[in-house]
Structure formats: C-alpha cells, structure tokens
C-alpha cells in the first residue's frame, strides 16, 4: 500500500480524511492533524511537512492549510458566553448566557436574545438542549401553581394543608398556592356560608 | 520575555475587601487570557475566572460568583482581582496566570491574609 | 464541575527512580490536561501540556500519556531537582480543576 506522495490519476486519494490531491504534481499527499498546519509543501520526493500552531491559534481539522486560524473569544455583546477555552485543536466553545436563547445561527450561534417570560400560571417547557430556542409557555398541570412572570420559573406543587396539621381555607389554583389555616381559627365570613352547607 | 508581576502581601480582617494587581510585560496584553488562581496554605490549586482584556470581558468560577471581580486596565498592562466578604478561609495566595493549553506562565503569588 | 483525582496524595523515592503518578478525571476530557512542578513558596511550573506535550525547556524525563479520563506523568528517573509537589489539571471546560497533587519526598 502505496504512502504519500504517491500518483493518482484519477485525482482522488485513499484516504480523503487524511490525504489531499496536489494537482500541480498529480500526487496525493498528506494533510496536518488538527492542531497544526503546512510549513512546507509536498512535492513528489517529500511528503507534507507539519508544524505546531502557535499560541493563540488552532486548525480543528485534517488540513492542507498555511496558517492556522486565530483564536477569538465569545462576544459576550452578542449574549455568549465561554463554556470551554481555545487549544491548538478547537476553537472557542461559547454558548447563550443565562436567561438567553439562540436568534441567529451560523454553523454556530452568532447572536442571543432574552427569553421570553411565561406568565403566572405556566412555565417554559422544558428542552434538550438550553440556549436552542426561546420559551414554549404551557399551562401548570393539575396541582400546581407558578405566580409570577419570569423565564425560569417552574410550578410548583400545591402545599396540602393537611401536611403541616391545617385545613385548606383557599383551593390553589394555576396561579396561586392553597391557603391554610388553623383548624381552630374560623373562616372568613365571606366563606361561612359555604361551610355551613 | 513574558513577565507577570504581582502587588505585595496583604493583610485584611474578616469582612473586608482585598484588590491584587498583576502587571504584564513582554506580550500583547490585549490578546491572551489572564486568569486567577489561589492556593491556600498546604492546600490545591483553585481556579477562579479570568479577563479578556480585549474586551475586558471576565467570566468567574460559579463558587466566587458575587465575591470576586476580575478588572483590566489596557493602558498599564494590568489585571486586578478583587475579592469582597473576605473570611479566614479565604487565606491563601493568589496568582494571576496567563493561559494557553494550561498555564504557562504565573506570576509569583501574592499572599493574602484574613484576621481577626 | 470535573473532579480530577490524583493518586497517591505522597510518595517516597530514591534518586534515579522511576516514578508514576495518575490522575482521573470524572469525565471526559479528551486530551485537555496539563501537568505542574511546585517547590515550596514558589509558582507552579508547566511540565506537560495536551497531556503529553512536554513544555519548552522541560527535561525529557519527564513524560506525560493518557486520554479521555486516564492520565499518568512519568519521570524516568528521579533526579534530586524533582522532589517537589506536582499537580494535574484539566483545561477541557469551565471552571478549570486540579487534582489534590502527590508530594514526592527523599526515602
């Protein structure tokens, strides 16, 4: 099995991953593992020569490139923010700031916005993956409650009375929580009427 | 060469606020990293957050979020690290560092010292 | 947060010993770790980066190997320069961790 350089006629190389085809010799050479880039081209007697990327620099692929590309940090402007540095082999991994959605993609996120906020008696559905896309609000399911506007907030369950040694004096509704008091305490003379039904 | 140097040894009672310099020379002060490390006595390394000062955009490890402000002036090359509510675990020394697959190059510590 | 454990926390060797210490992580970090040399009262040292690039000017007994969540800092023989407190760390994400370090002391 032939090692680069070696001709091709047919312009393709074995292995497209780790090799490239020069035209101007009709050969296929090496590429530069991630990390590095080509210091020296390859001609029909040498094969491709590799060097580090400096620092502050990175090739994230198999390449045949002369340079290495420039690390850049996340534009926390653009809502981003940094889930993992720079090295020779990747670049910057950034990712939506808290409370923050993806509105622009380009092979990666280039933009965040605010998410949206659910209204008392809903929250955000829950998603695979944070930061993909703005709030989906759905209702509280029975038994639960969620009083306030936010982004985040999730329902909570209903407090049962019962639990703390209390009587319900409010039911809980999507909104609000259930009210409870004292067995000893009465009720409020708005709702007398009702108990002594 | 690239040279990180530190402000001088502090002493601070719990409560308290700390601010420590870090000034570098020999590099493009704008395009790398400076981070803050601390180590508290015959303890490990605990990273804290770092500047870009390019941007003078600084991200923090959730642990100090709130207690800890990281700074950059452009002009003068230097890079601050504040820590507020200070108690005695806070003891320690602290480093700046700049990164690149680890950290290269630390300045040489400055010691921070929390009494009552 | 990755945990990264380090073992053993100390050990005892003689000059022109080989010696190994290990460090886990908790999960994967592919090969984003680093190794460190800290004598007394003085700043950590960067000895291996990428786990097993040695840093300029770092002697070649010492060596770095490991990927993923397995990695181990070798010096082929101990010279007596080398008793120190070395740490691990890992640089894959956010927020940087290292390991507890492992004292190599004079037997």
């Known amino acids: 099995q032939a090692v680069p350089p070696y001709a091709s006629e047919n312009q393709t190389c074995r292995d497209q991953e780790k090799e490239y085809y020069e035209p101007q010799h009709r050969i296929c050479c090496s590429r530069c593992p991630p990390g590095t880039y080509v210091s020296a081209k390859c001609s029909r007697i040498r094969d491709t020569v590799c060097a580090t990327c400096a620092e502050n620099s990175y090739n994230e692929h198999w390449n045949y490139l002369t340079i290495c590309q420039l690390c850049r940090p996340c534009d926390p402007v653009m809502g981003l923010e940094e889930i993992a540095p720079c090295t020779s082999k990747r670049k910057t991994q950034c990712r939506c700031q808290p409370g923050m959605f993806c509105a622009a993609w380009a092979l990666e996120c280039t933009h965040c916005e605010l998410l949206s906020d659910c209204p008392p008696g809903t929250e955000a559905e829950l998603k695979d993956e944070v930061g993909k896309g703005n709030n989906h609000c759905v209702p509280c399911k029975a038994g639960h409650f969620q009083n306030t506007s936010s982004p985040s907030a999730r329902c909570q369950p209903h407090t049962r009375c019962e639990n703390q040694g209390l009587v319900e004096a409010a039911p809980g509704t999507a909104q609000s929580d259930t009210t409870c008091k004292n067995p000893l305490e009465p009720l409020p003379p708005e709702m007398s009427g009702t108990m002594l039904m | 060469q690239v040279q990180l140097v530190q402000s001088g040894a502090e002493v601070k009672k719990p409560g308290e606020s700390v601010k420590v310099s870090c000034k570098a020379s020999?590099?493009?002060?704008?395009?790398?990293?400076l981070h803050w490390v601390r180590q508290a006595p015959g303890q490990g390394l605990e990273w804290m957050g770092w500047?870009?000062?390019?941007?003078?955009?600084?991200q923090y490890n959730e642990k100090f979020k709130g207690r800890v402000t990281i700074t950059a002036d452009k002009s003068t090359s230097t890079a601050y690290m504040e820590l507020s509510s200070l108690r005695s675990e806070d003891t320690a020394v602290y480093y700046c560092?700049?990164?690149?697959?680890?950290?290269?190059?630390w300045g040489q510590g400055t010691t921070v010292t929390v009494s009552s | 947060d990755i945990q990264m454990t380090q073992s053993p926390s100390s050990l005892s060797a003689s000059v022109g010993d080989r010696v190994t210490i290990t460090c886990k992580a908790s999960?994967?970090?592919?090969?984003?770790v680093a190794w460190y040399q800290q004598k007394p009262g003085k700043a950590p040292k960067l000895l291996i980066s990428?786990?097993?690039y040695r840093y300029s000017g770092v002697p070649s007994r010492f060596s770095g190997s490991g990927s993923g969540t397995d990695f181990t800092l070798t010096i082929s023989s101990l010279q007596p320069e080398d008793f120190a407190t070395y740490f691990c760390?890992?640089?894959?994400?956010?927020?940087?961790?290292f390991g507890q370090g492992t004292k190599v002391e004079i037997k």
């Open positions: 760390q890992q640089y894959d994400t956010y927020p940087f961790t």
């Open positions: 020999g590099y493009t002060f704008t395009t790398y990293y």
């Open positions: 999960q994967n970090v592919g090969i984003n």
């Open positions: 990428s786990a097993s």
């Open positions: 560092a700049r990164s690149w697959e680890g950290f290269p190059y």
């Open positions: 500047i870009y000062p390019g941007n003078v955009h600084a």
